[in-house]
Interface confidence: low
């Protein structure tokens, strides 16, 4: 638990609290924007992103986007507000502690996206079907 005297934010945003009224700290996420990747045909991959960022706003979560087309594979790692769409998709799994990739329909490419809310959770992106949303652990909301 966060001691009550600790200041919440790294910026001047409105104080954000969780459902229990506890102050919510900004998330720590991998944040390398778009980088070329060698992650292909694997159950899980590390992001190979060396930049860990404090998200600008306390409500933001970690996001990873894996894209493959005829020319290359890229992996995008960012912070994003789950109330807003990203690449035109809603972040349905933002409360998950793990980044479980789900395929999205995008013409001309294979497109997977995941979001999660534990520190640096978008460093390990998981494609394996053994992780799925029927696992109650993945639905736990992480209160920082």
């Amino acid at each position: 638990t966060i001691p009550p005297h600790v200041q919440k934010s790294v910026n001047n945003d409105m104080i954000v609290t969780d459902n229990n009224g506890a102050v919510k700290f900004p998330q720590l996420c991998k944040f390398c924007d778009v980088r070329f990747s060698t992650c292909d045909n694997q159950k899980s991959c590390m992001s190979n992103c060396s930049i860990t960022s404090i998200c600008e706003k306390p409500q933001e979560v970690c996001v990873a986007v894996w894209r493959k087309n005829d020319e290359n594979i890229t992996l995008e790692t960012v912070c994003h507000d789950p109330k807003l769409p990203y690449h035109d998709f809603i972040l349905e799994d933002a409360a998950s502690p793990k980044c479980i990739m789900k395929e999205k329909k995008k013409p001309g490419e294979t497109f997977f996206m995941c979001s999660c809310s534990s520190d640096e959770c978008n460093d390990n992106i998981i494609f394996s079907e053994e992780y799925n949303t029927s696992n109650p652990d993945l639905l736990l909301v992480i209160f920082q």
């Epitope: 600790v6 790294v10 700290f25 720590l28 944040f31 390398c32 924007d33 060396s50 930049i51 860990t52 960022s53 404090i54 600008e56 960012v78 912070c79 520190d119 640096e120």
Partner: antibody, heavy 121, light 107 residues
Framework: QVQLVESGGGLVQPGGSLRLSCAVS????????MSWVRQAPGKGLEWVSA????????DNTDSVKGRFSISRDNSKNTLYLQMNSLRAEDTAVYFC??????????????WGQGTLVTVSS | DIQMTQSPSSLSASVGDRVTITCRAS??????LNWYQQKPGKAPKLLIY???SLQSGVPSRFSGSGSGTDFTLTISSLQPEDFATYYC?????????FGQGTKVEIK
């Protein structure tokens, strides 16, 4: 007032060991990655080691791998660098530095005043 | 590892001069480039991060520019307290690496 104060430097013989400490105040230590950066006399800056905020991940420059170990005690707001099998080329001022990362941009700020390690027989 | 090369290694200038220091990366680092100032016997001090963002408390005569592999630190009007050594540093990939430094001396 953010402060980083290094200690533990000194003269040591080749093959010897030293443990550096960096006492931190003025910010919430447990939420930041930390690094050690060194500077040989009259030379430039060289990153040595880093540790994640929780302490579960570490990384070292190739020249110190297997010899140096970075650690932290978040309850004591202190960063450590255990240096074993010291060599003459490890002689340098060792700085601890707070790692900052916002919106994908990261940098070292602020830095401690440094502690001198001299490896000589 | 990404190599960072600064030029010149040293320069002599007078108070009021405009000073430019360049830093080149061995591969593209986007805008993941920081500049530090170090005075003798002191710790480095962050001046510019993310290639062009001025760190809080740093005088506006310092500015940074560049992207990809080529970067510049400019001091628009050199002041007596600016005589120091300046280092660039990439934060694009591990290990973070520094340039060899540029010493700015009084002419």
């Amino acid at each position: 007032q953010v402060q980083l104060v290094e200690s533990g430097g000194g003269l040591v013989q080749p093959g010897g060991s030293l443990r550096l400490s960096c006492a931190v105040s003025g910010f919430e230590f447990r939420r930041y990655a930390m690094s050690w950066v060194r500077q040989a006399p009259g030379k430039g800056l060289e990153w040595v080691s880093a540790i994640s905020a929780s302490g579960d991940r570490t990384d070292n420059t190739d020249s110190v791998k297997g010899r140096f170990s970075i650690s932290r005690d978040n309850s004591k707001n202190t960063l450590y660098l255990q240096m074993n099998s010291l060599r003459a080329e490890d002689t340098a001022v060792y700085f601890c530095a707070k790692g900052i990362a916002r919106s994908g941009k990261n940098f070292f700020d602020p830095w401690g005043q440094g502690t001198l390690v001299t490896v000589s027989s | 590892d990404i190599q960072m090369t600064q030029s010149p290694s040293s320069l002599s200038a007078s108070v009021g001069d405009r000073v430019t220091i360049t830093c080149r990366a061995s591969q593209s680092i986007s805008s993941y480039l920081n500049w530090y100032q170090q005075k003798p016997g002191k710790a480095p001090k962050l001046l510019i991060y993310a290639a062009s963002s001025l760190q809080s408390g740093v005088p506006s005569r310092f500015s940074g520019s560049g992207s990809g592999t080529d970067f510049t630190l400019t001091i628009s009007s050199l002041q007596p307290e600016d005589f120091a050594t300046y280092y660039c540093q990439q934060s694009y990939s591990t290990p973070p690496t520094f340039g060899q430094g540029t010493k700015v001396e009084i002419k």
